[in-house]
């Protein structure tokens, strides 16, 4: 077969080939940020000629052109400056309102390198309508100027811009416009991962963690899908495997889907996952009708077995057939469960379509979506039972109109996105499920994205101030209780001056809480063994503080999971009959268990908890500490089995002021507290300039560093005594 010519360079840019110079290969151009390629791609035809998709005239030289953002077409009740036909990257547009109108949205917007404006649509509103003025996004024209109940407004985009969002919106009885805000965008524009992750996550996370079977009541903030105890989520992952997707890109599709599966199974919802790859025909790798679709390892292994070569005989993009196979799956499940049953009607359905192009065979995918909406009986009341996310990757041949038509339209949410490449997709899936935004008390969720603050990464972490100074740390274990160390409180029982500082999204300094009640273990007495030559003894070094008010759950404040509770059992995805012993075996399951604690400056530091024979050799070092234990004969007099031991090799040592803080592990993207910082043989902060400076102990130090943490598995009777009506404990 003839190969295509190689004179296809783009001035100022680069290109990649999906299958070399052979027929069927897709050539994709890319340009530096702030520029876009024209044309975006070419296809090598069987004749040995390059063809530009959608082009009418003969092959033109590929060039990188400057990205521009669309200009306002009309701006009601105000003025904007400067008035240009379109705006360069970095250019600003400013909005002002006439007297009597108040500006809502962004007064100044900047054109970003992806051809999208930053900020929000500026609207000059006088508050006269039943619904607020829906505004006119940049580049759009609106018809309809009445904002009463039942009134409709319609939008279209000027010149060659593409509309995403709802072209028609209706003012609903609740004073909210139906659908989602329309945006006019350049055909070459794309979304940045940092914008997509939160937008996708906000919408998607409503479904996750919302089923917390241990919670009796639920406050619903905005749209939050309530998957009841009997409720269920079906997640359908559709992966494009057509010719234009390179094998490497398909691997990233698979990896992104795996990330998604891994994350979604880490939340306590009943979920079944379907996996469908498609090109000219769909291939169902996992059906929601298969019991294995509820098992994370089975789902991931079916994903791993997805083979790029499965579709080499039919390389078109038949999105209709892929969506239709979802419809058929739903139809079969409905017949199985019975159309009228709650079991069928209470299932929520989420479809994620990962594609790199427009469908080019099999009919309109919209038809399949209509069938799906029909079978699920999606109407205004049941709108929350279906979410379709259409994610285009590659911005070359992706059809904005089609993606927009497929994606769900829900107020304040976006369901259609175009990303620049598969790397960006991976980034989005890594960060989209930031369920730490949930308002209920789901435990052990920390934001793991790269741009999260320290407090968002460890939102259970609190600072305790018995005096004006910060003295100790602790961990939220519910919305009103903090677990910490008893030795932090050595001034008797007057806790009227004590304060607990909890993370707060509104303030970098956090929020201070008074203490209603302090429960300090009666067994704690630092001088208990003084007459045995043990000058300090930290047995039973544990305390609970009840805060004077409940903490509002947020990205910055959320409890950690305590093992041996039902809450932790759900987070570990363990079967219902699990015991405390099972949790210990799962969490402290090695001779050396990687764990973390939080430093004075809020960062997460690493340690290794030594178990079994390694625990013995870890603790043995204490016999070399002659000041605190001048005539110690048995190390176990000091290091009882209440303690976990760390501090060997490359471990960080906690400072004195980090006492009481959680020692925690990560499992399945959730965090579990197994211990609390108690005492040690070396203080890396001693005499340092500030919270950011720690000194490593010299290798020659005698005794070498060792750190001891109260083992929560050994404090169960005491924890149950005081938290029995706060947490749901499992049998021992």
């Amino acid at each position: 077969a003839p190969s295509c010519p190689q004179n296809v360079n783009i001035s100022g840019g680069t290109f990649t080939l999906s299958h070399g110079w052979a027929p069927g290969s897709l050539l994709t151009y890319s340009c530096p940020q702030g520029l876009y390629p024209s044309p975006a791609s070419r296809l090598c035809k069987s004749s040995g000629q390059w063809q530009t998709p959608g082009a009418t005239r003969s092959l033109s030289k590929a060039v990188c052109k400057p990205v521009r953002c669309p200009a306002p077409v009309s701006f009601e009740n105000g003025i904007y400056t400067p008035r240009l036909g379109s705006y360069p990257v970095g250019g600003n547009v400013s909005f002002e309102c006439e007297d009597g109108f108040i500006l809502r949205g962004s007064p100044v917007r900047q054109c970003r390198p992806n051809g999208m404006w930053d900020g929000e649509t500026a609207v000059c509103d006088n508050g006269a309508g039943h619904c607020p003025n829906p505004g006119i996004s940049l580049g759009a024209v609106r018809t309809g100027f009445r904002f009463g109940h039942g009134d409709k407004v319609r939008y279209r985009c000027s010149s060659n811009l593409v509309l995403t969002g709802s072209s028609e919106r209706e003012c609903q009885g609740n004073g909210v416009w139906s659908g989602t805000e329309p945006i006019c965008r350049q055909p070459y524009s794309y979304d940045f991962p940092e914008d997509v992750a939160p937008a996708l996550g906000t919408s998607f996370s409503h479904m996750l963690g919302a089923t917390n079977p241990t919670q009796k009541t639920k406050e619903s903030l905005g749209r939050k899908i309530q998957i009841q105890r009997s409720g269920h989520l079906n997640l359908y992952l559709l992966l494009d495997c057509s010719q234009s997707v390179s094998e490497n890109d398909f691997l990233i599709f698979k990896e992104s889907a795996s990330l998604m599966v891994d994350r979604i199974f880490s939340f306590e919802i009943n979920v079944s996952v379907a996996i469908i790859t498609f090109a000219s025909e769909p291939k169902v790798l996992m059906s929601v009708l298969n019991d294995n679709s509820r098992d994370m390892t089975e789902v991931i292994s079916s994903l791993e077995n997805a083979n790029y070569k499965d579709h080499e005989n039919g390389t078109g993009t038949n999105t209709y057939a892929a969506l239709n196979s979802v419809y058929l799956m739903m139809n079969n499940q409905m017949r199985l469960l019975g159309m009228e049953t709650m079991a069928w009607q209470e299932i929520r359905h989420a479809i994620i379509l990962l594609t790199d192009g427009k469908s080019n065979m099999g009919g309109s995918p919209k038809t399949a979506v209509d069938h799906i909406r029909e079978i699920l009986n999606i109407n205004q009341k049941r709108n929350d039972y279906l979410d379709i996310y259409a994610i285009g990757v590659g911005k070359l041949d992706v059809d904005w109109r089609e993606l927009n038509e497929l994606g769900s339209k829900k107020d304040g949410e976006r369901h259609a996105f175009i990303l620049q490449d598969t790397k960006a997709l991976h980034q989005v899936f890594e960060h989209m499920l930031d369920v730490s935004k949930l308002t209920d008390t789901i435990c052990g969720v920390g934001n793991m994205s790269a741009n999260a603050s320290d407090q968002e990464r460890t939102p259970w972490h609190v600072t305790i101030k018995p005096k004006s100074q910060e003295t100790c740390r602790g961990a939220l274990i519910s919305d009103q209780w903090v677990l910490t160390a008893a030795h932090c409180f050595r001034d008797g029982n007057d806790h009227s001056l004590w304060r607990v500082n909890v993370g707060d999204p509104k303030s970098q300094w956090g929020k201070e809480f008074l203490i209603e009640k302090a429960v300090i273990s009666p067994g704690f007495d630092v001088f208990a063994k003084k007459n045995q030559g043990i000058l300090e003894f930290y047995g039973d070094d544990i305390a609970l503080l009840k805060l004077a008010q409940k903490v509002k759950m947020s990205t910055h404040a959320r409890p950690i999971c305590l093992p041996c509770t039902m809450e932790a059992n759900l987070a570990l995805r363990r079967p219902q009959g699990s015991t405390c012993r099972d949790h210990e075996n799962e969490l402290l399951n090695k001779q050396s268990v990687p764990a973390h604690f939080v430093a004075l400056n809020g960062s997460k530091l690493n340690i290794n908890l030594k178990m079994g024979v390694e625990w013995t050799s870890c603790a043995e070092v204490v016999s070399q500490e002659k000041t605190m234990f001048p005539n110690l004969t048995d190390v176990r007099e000091v290091v009882t089995d209440q303690f976990l031991c760390s501090g060997t090799q490359e471990d960080e040592s906690p400072c004195k002021g980090e006492s009481g803080g959680a020692v925690f592990l990560e499992r399945r993207f959730r965090f579990f507290q197994v211990g609390l910082v108690s005492w040690g043989l070396y203080n890396p902060c001693l005499g340092s300039a500030d919270k950011n400076s720690r000194k490593r102990a010299p290798r020659s130090k005698v005794p070498p560093p060792r750190d001891f943490h109260i083992n929560l598995f050994r404090m169960q009777p005491w924890l149950r005594q005081h938290l029995g009506d706060v947490l749901n404990f499992l049998p021992l």
């Epitope: 100074q469 100790c472 004075l600 000041t627 002021g657 203080n683 300039a689």
Partner: nanobody
């Protein structure tokens, strides 16, 4: 907050000894970690020694280990620093400090004495 007053500084020959005292007002002395810092002319303030609130554990800077001993008497609300084998480089103003957490971070310490000068010279 604890009020602190140091005493016992003075001029001493190399190899000589000196005992510094720091008396604290306030009934909460016994619940504070106590420490000594020093500042030589033109230099940063540096950590010398610390003792836990129980008196059970002590820590020393490498430069004074084996020569200086920190101790406390909770019944007298007093902290001590016994300095032996003094050297010229020990010349500095010595400050007593109280810290509830025990980390003695220079940025956070709010209880300092006014200092006592120790000069080691022949």
């Amino acid at each position: 907050q604890v009020q602190l007053v140091e005493s016992g500084g003075g001029l001493v020959q190399p190899g000589g000894s000196l005992r510094l005292s720091c008396s604290a007002s306030g009934h909460t002395f016994r619940s504070y970690y106590m420490g000594w810092f020093r500042q030589a002319p033109g230099k940063e303030r540096e950590f010398v020694a610390a003792i836990s609130w129980t008196g059970g554990s002590t820590e020393y800077a490498d430069s004074v280990k084996g020569r200086f001993t920190i101790s406390r008497d909770n019944s007298k609300n007093t902290l001590y620093l016994q300095m032996n084998s003094l050297r010229a480089e020990d010349t500095a103003v010595y400050y007593c400090a109280a810290d509830y957490s025990g980390d003695f971070l220079l940025s956070d310490l709010d209880s300092w004495g006014q200092g006592t000068l120790v000069t080691v010279s022949s």
